[in-house]
């Protein structure tokens, strides 16, 4: 009976299966295979075609999101015949039950918060769970500390980011006794979600004609060197009329972070504060504490 089924619907003979944990699509190896390819098509008709694994009976998708639903497809030619099979991977569960407004940010160099909102059609007993997989080791991190709202998980706090890599896959699953809950998934770059601390060790030293501002680059989660930073200095004269523009100075990161500017004695009271950003993204940190220099009677 099974062999009849195969001839009537030859696609079934490939037995295509997808493991969402490993993002691995696999099928039954066919003897004398001359060609094989796998790909997925998403709801926007974008096609993703990964490299085949060495055994040619599986392929791994590296950077894909599945929550909108995708269709996997496998084409195999053998010396005798050709096979094709589609595998629908829908996001089963009631529409509108998945977590929404999902976002994460890294702060203080080694902490991360992720937050989300309950889906609009989710039942009262819904519970959400966050899993994170890194791109390199495919290791799964389960949320260690949930942030709750009336007993429902609506966020997660991580204080150990050692398992993350530069790009990570975030999955929010849901459960309910009443109905099926859809999942939400997202790929996030750590460099895009990190909020830097302001620069540290800000000092100002003045002589008769100039003032020299020095600072240290902030400690970050990402491995960044000095040229990867951009700084902004706000040099502000105290007790000026409201509406007077501050002097904002852009300074590229350097091995010795410093800015020397002319300021002759007697000098009025000034303050300086500094903020930092990744030079590629310019996602500014908050300002450092203002440092005052000069005198009231300057």
């Amino acid at each position: 009976e099974k062999s009849d089924l195969r001839t009537v619907a030859p696609a079934s003979s490939l037995n295509v299966r997808f493991d969402s944990r490993t993002m691995n699509l696999s099928w039954d190896c066919q003897e004398n295979t001359t060609f094989s390819k796998c790909f997925l098509t998403d709801k926007k008709n974008r096609v993703v075609e990964p490299r085949l694994s060495n055994n040619e009976c599986s392929c791994t998708f590296r950077e894909i999101c599945l929550h909108e639903g995708v269709t996997f497809e496998v084409h195999v030619n053998t010396s005798q015949r050709g096979f094709q099979q589609k595998l629908l991977y829908p996001n089963s569960g009631r529409e509108g039950t998945a977590a929404q407004n999902f976002s994460c940010f890294i702060y203080n160099a080694d902490l991360m918060n992720c937050t989300w909102a309950r889906g609009p059609t989710a039942p009262r007993d819904v519970q959400y769970f966050l899993y994170i997989r890194n791109s390199k080791r495919r290791r799964e991190i389960r949320c260690p500390y949930y942030i709750q709202d009336s007993g429902t998980h609506v966020g997660c706090h991580l204080d150990n980011l050692s398992g993350l890599t530069s790009r990570n896959y975030f999955l929010v699953n849901g459960t309910s006794r009443e109905i099926g809950i859809q999942f939400f998934d997202s790929l996030l770059d750590t460099k895009k979600i990190e909020r830097f601390n302001p620069p540290s060790n800000v000092t100002v030293r003045c002589n008769t004609t100039h003032c020299l501002v020095r600072w240290k680059q902030p400690r970050t989660y990402q491995k960044l060197s000095y040229l990867d930073f951009q700084y902004q200095l706000d040099v502000h004269r105290k007790n000026t009329q409201p509406g007077t523009e501050n002097l904002l100075i852009n300074v590229s990161g350097d091995l010795e972070n410093r800015y020397n500017f002319p300021s002759s004695e007697p000098r009025a009271k000034h303050s300086v504060k500094i903020r930092a950003a990744d030079v590629r993204i310019l996602n500014w940190s908050s300002w450092s504490e203002a440092i005052e220099f000069g005198s009231d009677d300057g």
Partner: antibody, heavy 120, light 111 residues
Framework: QVQLVQSGAEVKKPGASVKVSCKIS????????IHWVRQTPTKGFEWMGG????????VYAQRFQGRVTMTEDTSIDTAYLTLSSLRSDDTAVYYC?????????????WGKGTMVTVSS | QAVLTQPSSVSGAPGQRVTISCTGS?????????VSWYQQLPGTAPKLLIY???KRPSGVPDRFSASKSGTSASLAITGLQADDEADYYC???????????FGGGTKLTVL
């Protein structure tokens, strides 16, 4: 001002080892990522290896693996390159450099280079 | 054979504009990894001219600019001066195998 001062030129026989030093002044070595690059007239620049903060260890280019060792003595702000089993095609100028950006690995400060000649 | 391909030489008269190309592949420049450019005057160590594809370290004149598109990058020098005569190298990271790669170098002659 940061400076990288390298040891003097060396002449070695095939099969021998050479150790080149790179002394950092004006900054603490422990805060830097030092890499080694060599230059030959035939092959141009070849990256040999250096400290990768992502891996938190010194990483080596595949073609030098097993023959090269890079060490650091942070107490005297000095990095060392040792290349063993020298061959005539290891004749090159060896540079130490500081990584100024980890995005694409840009080398900002360079030593003046150490000429190593391998000849029988 | 360098993985990043550059023309062996270019030339231009003082005041002119010249460009130097650097062609890579999908495992380096197109991956996309950032490109850096270096100037090496005869008998000296290289000097960083460009990093992050188009950023200049402090002290590098704005006559030097660079861009990147797909698997290629290019360095442009405007208002050519006699002391620009040097060798120019592009450099990027490569994931196959994971190594830092340099171009073969381009000799710039100021006529």
């Amino acid at each position: 001002q940061v400076q990288l001062v390298q040891s003097g030129a060396e002449v070695k026989k095939p099969g021998a080892s050479v150790k080149v030093s790179c002394k950092i002044s004006g900054h603490s070595l422990s805060e830097l990522s030092i890499h080694w690059v060599r230059q030959t007239p035939t092959k141009g620049f070849e990256w040999m290896g250096g400290f990768d903060p992502e891996e938190n260890e010194i990483v080596y280019a595949q073609r030098f693996q097993g023959r090269v060792t890079m060490t650091e003595d942070t107490s005297i702000d000095t990095a060392y390159l040792t290349l063993s089993s020298l061959r005539s095609d290891d004749t090159a100028v060896y540079y130490c450099s500081i990584v100024g950006s980890f995005s694409g690995w840009a080398f900002d400060y360079w030593g003046k280079g150490t000429m190593v000649t391998v000849s029988s | 054979q360098a993985v990043l391909t550059q023309p062996s030489s270019v030339s231009g008269a003082p005041g002119q504009r010249v460009t130097i190309s650097c062609t890579g592949s999908g495992s380096n420049i197109g991956a996309p990894y950032d490109v850096s450019w270096y100037q090496q005057l005869p008998g000296t160590a290289p000097k960083l001219l460009i990093y992050h594809n188009n950023k200049r370290p402090s002290g590098v004149p704005d006559r030097f600019s660079a861009s990147k598109s797909g698997t290629s990058a290019s360095l442009a020098i405007t208002g050519l001066q006699a002391d620009d005569e040097a060798d120019y190298y592009c450099q990027s990271y490569d994931s196959e195998p994971t190594e830092i790669r340099f171009g073969g170098g381009t000799k710039l002659t100021v006529l």
